[in-house]
Amino acid sequence: KSSNEATNITPKHNMKAFLDELKAENIKKFLYNFTQIPHLAGTEQNFQLAKQIQSQWKEFGLDSVELAHYDVLLSYPNKTHPNYISIINEDGNEIFNTSLFEPPPPGYENVSDIVPPFSAFSPQGMPEGDLVYVNYARTEDFFKLERDMKINCSGKIVIARYGKVFRGNKVKNAQLAGAKGVILYSDPADYFAPGVKSYPDGWNLPGGGVQRGNILNLNGAGDPLTPGYPANEYAYRRGIAEAVGLPSIPVHPIGYYDAQKLLEKMGGSAPPDSSWRGSLKVPYNVGPGFTGNFSTQKVKMHIHSTNEVTRIYNVIGTLRGAVEPDRYVILGGHRDSWVFGGIDPQSGAAVVHEIVRSFGTLKKEGWRPRRTILFASWDAEEFGLLGSTEWAEENSRLLQERGVAYINADSSIEGNYTLRVDCTPLMYSLVHNLTKELKSPDEGFEGKSLYESWTKKSPSPEFSGMPRISKLGSGNDFEVFFQRLGIASGRARYTKNWETNKFSGYPLYHSVYETYELVEKFYDPMFKYHLTVAQVRGGMVFELANSIVLPFDCRDYAVVLRKYADKIYSISMKHPQEMKTYSVSFDSLFSAVKNFTEIASKFSERLQDFDKSNPIVLRMMNDQLMFLERAFIDPLGLPDRPFYRHVIYAPSSHNKYAGESFPGIYDALFDIESKVDPSKAWGEVKRQIYVAAFTVQAAAETLSEVA
C-alpha cells in the first residue's frame, strides 16, 4: 500500500487543504453565537449549547457525536441570600457593604442568569475579625509574614490580591496559616495595564469588575465526591466531609473599588518591601486590623453559597481513522463559562468548531485521517476540570491503551503579541516544524513564518534561535490526560508581551466584561490571531492523526531530562553538608538520564532507517513512541497526590498553573532546612531520587530494541 492509503489526495495537499479551509470569518461568527448568553456549568443554557454543538458537528460530517453526562458536585450562590462582605462597627452595625453584582456591560443590561461574583465551593459562614493583608498569599508571602514579620494569621480574615498563582493555592495557604476567611481582590497593579482604558472603552478591568473562580485543591481528582471513578448513575459518592479538595473557610472575591474601602483603613505593620504594594492609593499595611481611629471596626463575611450534585454534559465527536482506528488523537476544550465567556472558553470553542468543520469538509470529499480523531466539548472545567476528568476516568482503559495525543483548546487568546505553547518535549519538533510552515499574523512580520516572529518575540532562554516552549502545569483540561494517564499533550494560544505587561492573565478574566465585543473591538478585530491559533492547534492534530510515523522526537526528552536533573541537583547542592551527612547522591539519576539519551539516539537512528512499508514494524515503532509518555507514569502517584502520576512533570504544589520538573524530588527538598526531622526529610529526598532514576531508566528501556 502507498503511504497515502488513508486518503485520495496527496499527503502534502491534505494538510494544505485542511489549513486553507479554516476561515477567520467563521471563527468570528461562531464566537458571536457562543457568547450571547451565559453558559454556566450545570445550567439549562449550557445543556442547550451542548445539544447545538452536537447537532452542528453532525452536520459538519463527523461519524458520530454523543453527549456524555455525569452528576458532579458544583457550587452556586444562593439567589435569595447574596454573598457580601461588610465593615462592622463596635455595635455590629454594617457601615460598609461590598457590591452584590458587577454593573453589566452596555447591551447586556437585560440578560438574565448572570451569576454574581463568588468563589465556587466556598463553605457557608459569617466569620468576623481583623484583617491581615497577605500580598498574593503565596507560600513565600506567608513565610515573610510568619517567619520574618512574626505576624500570626490565626483567627484572622486575610485579604489577598489575585495573580501570580492559582487562587486555590492562596486559599490552601491561608487555611494552613489558621485564617478564618479569605477575601480575594483584583489589584490594578495586576489587572490594569497602564495607558489602556477600562471596559467598555478598553480592555482593562473597571473598579466594579470581579474575577470569579473555583478555590478547590483537587490535585487532579475530578468530581470531589467520586475521586478516581466516573460520576455515573451508579456511582458511590463520598459524604461532603470526605469530599476531595473543598476549602474549609469562607472565601469571596471583590473588585478594586471595594478593596480600596477595606485596605485604606489597614493599620499594623507596614508592607515589608515594595513588592507588597499594589497600585491603589492605600498604604498596603499588613495589619492585623484597622488603624487607630478605626481599630474597633471589624470585617465580616456573609457567605451562603451551596454545593449541589448537578448534571453536566460533554460533547464527544468521532472521526474514525482509516488505517489505525484504534489510535486516538484528541482535541478538547471546554464549553462552560462563568458568564459570557468571550475569551474563556469561547474563543477556544469557536476555533475547535472551525477545526471540526474543516475536517468534516475533507471527510465529505472522501478523505479520512490515518488515526481516529476525537473532538470534545468539555463541561464544568471552571468547577475543577470536572467534565474532562470524569470522561477520562470512565474511558481510562481505552485511553491508556489507545491515546496518542491530547491537544487542549481553551482560550485562543490572552493577548495579541505572540504565540505561547506548553507541551511535552515529544511535541517540540512537531511545533517547530509546523510553525515554520505557517504565516505569521504579526505586524512587521509580513511574509515571515510564525516560527520567526515567535522566536524573535519569545526566545528560548536556553536554546539559541529557538522559541520558548513551557512545561505543562495544570488549571486546564489536559490535566487528566497528561498528569494522570501519561498521554502526550500540548496547548497553544496567542499571548501578551510578558516583558512589558506584568499583570496576571488578562484583566477581564472571569468577569462579566469578558464579552464578544471585548475580542472583536480590542483583541482581534480581524480574527487573524484566532485563525493562527486554529492553524496551530488544527495542524498539530492533523499531523498527529495523519503522519505515517508519529511526529514525536524522543531526543528532545533526553535534552530536557538532563536540564531538569541539573536544576534539581543544583537546588540540592544548596545543602552540601547535609548531602554529605546523609549520603545523598544523584549519580543514579544522572546515569539513568545518560542511558535514556543514548537509547533515544539509537532509537532515532532506527526510526530513520526502518522499512516504513512494513506495517508491523511501523506499528511497533509508533507504539514505542506513543507509550514513551506513558512510561513516565508511576502507578503509585506522587506523595499525597495520587492522581498526579507523571514523574517528570506535575503541577507545582505552590501554584497549580505552573509545571514543576522532577516534582517528587523538588517537593522533598522544598523548605527542607525547616523540617523537624532532617534525617527523615533527607531520607525522602533519597527515595524520590531513586523513584526518578528508576522511572527514567524504565522509560529508556521502552525505547530499546524489542529483541
Epitope: Y428, S429, H432, E462, F463, S464, G465, M466, R555, D556, A558, V559, R562, A565, D566, Y569, S570, M573, P576, F586, D587, L589, F590, S591, K594, T597, E598, S601, E605
Partner: antibody, heavy 122, light 111 residues
Framework: EVQLVESGGGLVKPGGSLRLSCAAS????????MNWVRQAPGKGLEWVSS????????YYADSVKGRFTISRDSAKNSLYLQMNSLRAEDTAVYYC???????????????WGQGTTVTVSS | QSVLTQPPSVSGAPGQRVTISCTGS?????????VHWYQQVPGTVPKLLIY???NRPSGVPDRFSGSKSGTSASLAITGLQAEDETVYYC???????????FGGGTKLTVL
C-alpha cells in the same frame, strides 16, 4: 577516511566579519553534534559553539554570544561559523570537531580538522 | 582561569608512571558529567585520548588510562616514553555555564 577540513580563515580588521566552513567526509554527518573550538597563540583550547544533528539545539560560549552564528547543511556535509564584530581577542586557530554522539554535553570530540587561522588586527 | 584546574606541568622519567589531575566542581564533574582527555603535540591537532572518564579510542595504547571520582579526574600514563612529552587537556561540560569547558592544559616532560 573520516575527515574534517576547515577553510575561510584570514586577516580581518576589528569589527569585521568572516565565515568559516568545515567540510566533513567519511561518516554520517547528519547524525552527529558538531563543534567549533579555538586556540589562541600559545594558549589552551577554548570551546566556541555547538550545533546538534538537526540544528535545533545551538549553544555558544559567553565570549562569542550575539556575535557568532553556527549553522550546518547536512545535504552538503558542511558546518559553518559566521563571525561578526570580530575583536583582537578572537585571534586564534579555529578547529571544527565532531562529537562522538548528538549531545555535546556528554561526549568527547573524536575527529578534529586541521584548523584555520583567524587573525584580527588593524 | 579555567573552570577545570590542571597542573601546568608534570614530569617523569622514561618507564615511570605519571598522573595528571583535573579538578572541577559540583557543576561539572560533580554533576555527573564525564571527563574526556586530549593530547596535543605543539603545532598539530588535538587528539582524543580518553573518553567518558576511562575509555580509550581504538589506536590509543593501554599505557593511557583515565578515572573520575566526585569532582576530580585523573589521567595516568604508565611506561612513560619520549613521544609522550606533549600537552594534555581535560574536557567536560559545566551546567552553570551551559557550555563545554577545557582544563588549562598540562605540559608533560619526560626527563
Amino acid at each position: 577516511e573520516v575527515q574534517l577540513v576547515e577553510s575561510g580563515g584570514g586577516l580581518v580588521k576589528p569589527g569585521g566579519s568572516l565565515r568559516l566552513s568545515c567540510a566533513a567526509s567519511g561518516f554520517t554527518f547528519s547524525r552527529y553534534n558538531m563543534n567549533w573550538v579555538r586556540q589562541a597563540p600559545g594558549k589552551g583550547l577554548e570551546w566556541v559553539s555547538s550545533i546538534n544533528s538537526n540544528s535545533r539545539y545551538i549553544y555558544y560560549a559567553d565570549s562569542v554570544k550575539g556575535r557568532f552564528t553556527i549553522s550546518r547543511d547536512s545535504a552538503k556535509n558542511s558546518l559553518y561559523l559566521q563571525m561578526n564584530s570580530l575583536r583582537a581577542e578572537d585571534t586564534a586557530v579555529y578547529y571544527c570537531a565532531k562529537t562522538m554522539g548528538d549531545y555535546y554535553y556528554y561526549y568527547g570530540m573524536d575527529v578534529w580538522g586541521q584548523g584555520t587561522t583567524v587573525t584580527v588586527s588593524s | 582561569q579555567s573552570v577545570l584546574t590542571q597542573p601546568p606541568s608534570v614530569s617523569g622519567a622514561p618507564g615511570q608512571r605519571v598522573t595528571i589531575s583535573c579538578t572541577g566542581s559540583s557543576f561539572n564533574l560533580g554533576a555527573g558529567y564525564d571527563v574526556h582527555w586530549y593530547q596535543q603535540v605543539p603545532g598539530t591537532v588535538p587528539k582524543l585520548l580518553i573518553y567518558d572518564n576511562s575509555n580509550r579510542p581504538s589506536g590509543v595504547p593501554d599505557r593511557f588510562s583515565g578515572s573520575k571520582s566526585g569532582t576530580s579526574a585523573s589521567l595516568a600514563i604508565t611506561g612513560l616514553q619520549a613521544e609522550d612529552e606533549t600537552v594534555y587537556y581535560c574536557q567536560s561540560y559545566d551546567s552553570s555555564l551551559s557550555g563545554v569547558v577545557f582544563g588549562g592544559g598540562t605540559k608533560l616532560t619526560v626527563l
